[in-house]
């Protein structure tokens, strides 16, 4: 199907409190319907985003309003096609205690790529 | 422009079985989700299930799983909630949504806007 | 199952300012929405996530979030605005969504 699924970036630290997008940009397919996993388990999440850049490029947003110490880990999206599971390269989302000054570190995948967005 | 064509008001026995739908209209059906709402009357607003997009997964609120089934046809454009076998509890205004609203962050699919006019499922013997 | 509590009634003079409050355990990891819904008609949105007003809706309508509390603010309270209000969010796990139980607002 010349499906291409990535997250990006491949590492991000957050402080403990703050909101956070992690993205997922799927190319080659319609309205896909995205699932996010964290650590093997698929994340429920009914209020997450989307943006359609174009008919077969769509990108995704798994929204968290509020990071606590529950929320680290590895994240990873995943569409259906045809039958299978494409699953995107995973995040590794860390925290820094409330009040640090948290940074992130992005290594692209695609130049096209943005970054996570971090406004509520 | 939107719009979400619900089909009409019905009277049925306790233990009959339902199926309304809702058509839409204005705007690429798989774009967006449906999702239902229940009113009991004078009462208020209970969220009862999302269908996503391609209708591969549903979404259903507690008092509803297994009693209803959300589900739709992309062919033409139309969301379904059907019941086995109705009660008299069931008696209610039921909304479909169109689940999903342009903001400047994106689609976010549980911004309610597009609100059908409702269908009323009227339950008694 | 997963609850989100509002008080049943509000009541302000015009020109006031009215405050409905929803409350909720998971609120503090989960974004609240905001319905007004006037007699015999369908309900409207009027804030998202939290804060974002909808597209349509007059500048008096606001939002806020703090800890297990979300908050509709009307600042200058009008006839029209009279309705019941509902907040909206999803459950903790995050697969099913929830309605308040609604509060009337009155305007007189």
């Known amino acids: 199907a010349g499906l291409k699924l990535m997250g990006a970036p491949v590492k991000l630290t957050v402080s403990q409190g703050q909101p956070v997008k992690l993205n997922c940009s799927v190319e080659g397919m319609e309205e896909p319907d995205i699932q996010w996993v964290k650590d093997g388990a698929v994340v429920q999440n009914l209020d997450q985003l989307y943006i359609p850049v174009s008919e077969q490029h769509w990108i995704g947003f798994l929204s968290l309003k509020s990071v606590e110490r529950s929320d680290a880990g590895r994240y990873w999206c995943q569409v259906e096609d045809g039958g299978e599971t494409e699953i995107s390269q995973p995040v590794w989302l860390t925290l820094v205690p409330r009040g640090s000054s948290a940074h992130h570190h992005h290594h692209h995948h695609h130049s096209a790529w943005s970054h996570p967005q971090f406004e509520k | 422009e939107v719009q979400l064509v619900q089909s009409g008001a019905d009277v049925k026995k306790p233990g009959a079985s339902l199926t309304i739908s809702c058509q839409a209209s204005g705007y690429t059906f798989t774009d967006y989700w449906i999702s239902w709402v229940r009113q009991k009357p004078g009462k208020g607003l209970e969220w009862m299930g999302r269908i996503s997009r391609h209708g591969s997964q549903t979404y259903y609120g507690p008092s509803f799983q297994g009693h209803v089934t959300i589900s739709a046809d992309r062919s033409t454009a139309t969301a379904y909630l059907q019941w086995r076998s109705l009660e008299a509890s069931d008696t209610a205004m039921y909304y479909c949504?169109?689940?999903?609203?342009?903001?400047?962050?994106?689609?976010?699919?549980?911004?309610?806007?597009?609100w059908g006019p409702g269908t009323l499922v009227t339950v008694s013997s | 199952s997963y609850e989100l509590t509002q008080p049943p009634s509000v009541s302000v003079s015009p020109g006031q300012t009215a405050r409905i409050t929803c409350s909720g355990d998971?609120?503090?990891?989960?974004?609240a929405y905001w319905y007004q819904q006037k007699s015999g008609q369908a309900p409207v949105l009027v804030i998202y996530e939290d804060h974002k007003r909808a597209s349509g809706i007059p500048e008096r309508f606001s939002g806020s979030s703090s800890g297990t509390m979300a908050t509709l603010t009307i600042s200058g309270a009008q006839v029209e605005d009279e309705a019941d209000y509902y907040c909206?969010?999803?459950?903790?796990?995050?697969?099913?969504?929830?309605f308040g139980g609604g509060t009337k607002l009155t305007v007189l």
């Open positions: 949504v169109r689940a999903g609203g342009q903001t400047s962050g994106g689609t976010i699919p549980e911004y309610y806007q597009h």
């Open positions: 909206y969010s999803i459950s903790p796990a995050g697969n099913y969504g929830v």
């Open positions: 998971a609120l503090p990891k989960k974004y």
